[in-house]
């Protein structure tokens, strides 16, 4: 599945993992029907996808969550796709926001993020959410990936 | 539009089709502004995209639906992107869920699914929904496609 | 970042820009963490992405908006990805619809559109929404892009 020795395919798709950590950064695993094309992209500490080669990447994330307006803060549920590059400030690449549902006990909603970005060698991307406890981890509901153009 | 004789572009984008069938599998057609790059990807029985070559594919679906909380079951509207490979279990690749709207007669919502997956020769992908009668078939609202990396 | 002299990478990702114009066409800018691979794709008049080469493109848009059912029209918020080709009628490629929220003063929601389409030389794609004043322009919330396969 090579484009050529100098230009191998680089792609990843990882699956959400419930976590007891209080961090807002989502956790991921190489489980189920995951993709990890080769060692030019790696999942580090279960939280970020790190690339070894500079280039243009299409990066995406999908987050399904279940929340209720009364039980949640006034602020909407926000999912953010973020970038860490060596020697640079972290930055937000993409965000999506959904107001909490009035359904009881909670209403499910899904968010999809995706865009083309230039990544440097050693750059990492990760996904932040406002409340990780609301994220749905059933088969296929929440995932994260990238592909090099 | 060839990458080379041995590595042609493979891509498809098909358009939703209303169906009188009671199945939860959505129906699609090569109509409107559709894409079918060549015979290395085909639309079979109006319901599944089937690929002839092994490789990494970005697969996506968009479903717009109109539903009302009172008129629908308690369960949310769920769209699932599923995979059939010869001699393998069928499997859910991606799912998204949206709680029904309180708007009357119904409230429209759109779901987008997408991810990178390895497909085997003869593998087929299809889209399941909880209630096909709620799906919107107006121009551009509901579509399904893939591209080979 | 070339595939070869005859086959350079073509990709763009542009960022939403608030506008005082009353048009329903969203405005975009090359600002923040944008992508513009080369002059084979350009942002024209801040409103459309125009390609110089024929081929298959994955085109996407994300729109986050904040609306309230009582303060909005009965009709849902609709985002449309549209195509203009030289000497052809404009056409809708993709649409997504979300019913307005009952949250006050307004409830945020995000829409994602994406699909594979054949574009002709000189073709332009742009994004229409029902009410541009409801669009969220905070970092990462609303963006638009494409990549050539």
């Amino acid at each position: 599945m090579q484009k050529g020795d100098q230009n191998p395919q680089i792609a990843a798709h990882v699956i959400s993992e419930a976590s007891s950590k209080t961090t807002s950064v989502l956790q991921w695993a190489e489980k189920g029907y995951y993709t990890m094309s080769n060692n030019l992209v790696t999942l580090e500490n279960g939280k970020q996808l790190t690339v070894k080669r500079q280039g243009l990447y299409y990066i995406y994330a999908q987050v399904t969550f279940c929340s209720n307006r009364e039980a949640s803060s006034q602020a909407p549920f926000i999912a953010s796709l973020c970038l860490k590059s060596p020697g640079r400030f972290e930055r937000i690449l993409l965000r999506a926001a959904n107001t909490h549902s009035s359904a009881k006990p909670c209403g499910q909603q899904s968010i999809h993020l995706g865009g083309v970005f230039e990544l440097q060698p050693g750059a990492s991307v990760f996904v932040n959410v406002t409340d990780p406890s609301q994220v749905s981890h059933g088969t296929g509901f929440t995932s994260f990936g990238l592909l090099k153009l | 539009m060839q990458k080379g004789d041995q590595n042609p572009q493979i891509a498809a984008h098909v358009i939703s089709e209303a169906s009188s069938k009671t199945t939860s599998v959505l129906q699609w057609a090569e109509k409107g502004y559709y894409t079918m790059s060549n015979n290395l990807v085909t639309l079979e029985n109006g319901k599944q995209l089937t690929v002839k070559r092994q490789g990494l594919y970005y697969i996506y679906a968009q479903v717009t639906f109109c539903s009302n909380r009172e008129a629908s079951s308690q369960a949310p509207f769920i769209a699932s992107l599923c995979l059939k490979s010869p001699g393998r279990f069928e499997r859910i690749l991606l799912r998204a869920a949206n709680t029904h709207s309180s708007a009357k007669p119904c409230g429209q919502q759109s779901i987008h699914l997408g991810g990178v997956f390895e497909l085997q020769p003869g593998a087929s992908v299809f889209v399941n929904v909880t209630d096909p009668s709620q799906v919107s078939h107006g121009t551009g609202f509901t579509s399904f496609g893939l591209l080979k990396l | 970042m070339q595939k070869g002299d005859q086959n350079p990478q073509i990709a763009a990702h542009v960022i939403s820009e608030a506008s005082s114009k009353t048009t329903s066409v969203l405005q975009w800018a090359e600002k923040g963490y944008y992508t513009m691979s080369n002059n084979l794709v350009t942002l024209e008049n801040g409103k459309q992405l125009t390609v110089k080469r024929q081929g298959l493109y994955y085109i996407y848009a994300q729109v986050t908006f904040c609306s309230n059912r009582e303060a909005s029209s009965q009709a849902p918020f609709i985002a449309s990805l549209c195509l203009k080709s030289p000497g052809r009628f404009e056409r809708i490629l993709l649409r997504a619809a979300n019913t307005h929220s009952s949250a006050k003063p307004c409830g945020q929601q995000s829409i994602h559109l994406g699909g594979v389409f054949e574009l002709q030389p000189g073709a332009s794609v742009f994004v229409n929404v029902t009410d541009p004043s409801q669009v969220s322009h905070g970092t990462g919330f609303t963006s638009f892009g494409l990549l050539k396969l």
Epitope: H13, E30, K31, G32, Y33, Y34, T35, M36, S37, H137, G138, T139, G140 | L56, R88, F89, R91, I92, F117, E118, Q120 | -
Partner: nanobody, 123 residues
Framework: EVQLVESGGGLVQPGGSLRLSCAAS????????MGWFRQAPGKEREFVAV????????LYADSVKGRFTISADNSKNTAYLQMNSLKPEDTAVYYC????????????????WGQGTLVTVSS
Amino acid sequence: EVQLVESGGGLVQPGGSLRLSCAASGNIFRINAMGWFRQAPGKEREFVAVIYSSDGSTLYADSVKGRFTISADNSKNTAYLQMNSLKPEDTAVYYCAAEPYGSGSSLISEYDWGQGTLVTVSS
């Protein structure tokens, strides 16, 4: 490796019901999914139903939707296939299969298979 033992097959009249069981032993922590295939005489083995261990989500072949139900009892490490409204075309050897955990999309990992149990639907 996972060992799988099926039971519950037999002869049944059209419209009747059967319940197949598949008991797993060995490296059961390695199981991502359990399910059923069937093979009719002179035909290829075909997928029937699957249940995923992570959340119990299920999928069925079109030909059995609404008639067959797959379930699992994790405490007994057993999967079940409840078959109702049986038809003559359901006649086949039914095989239980288990898919290893973390097999990934770029690996075609080998399934573990049971020996099969014969279901005959005939009047």
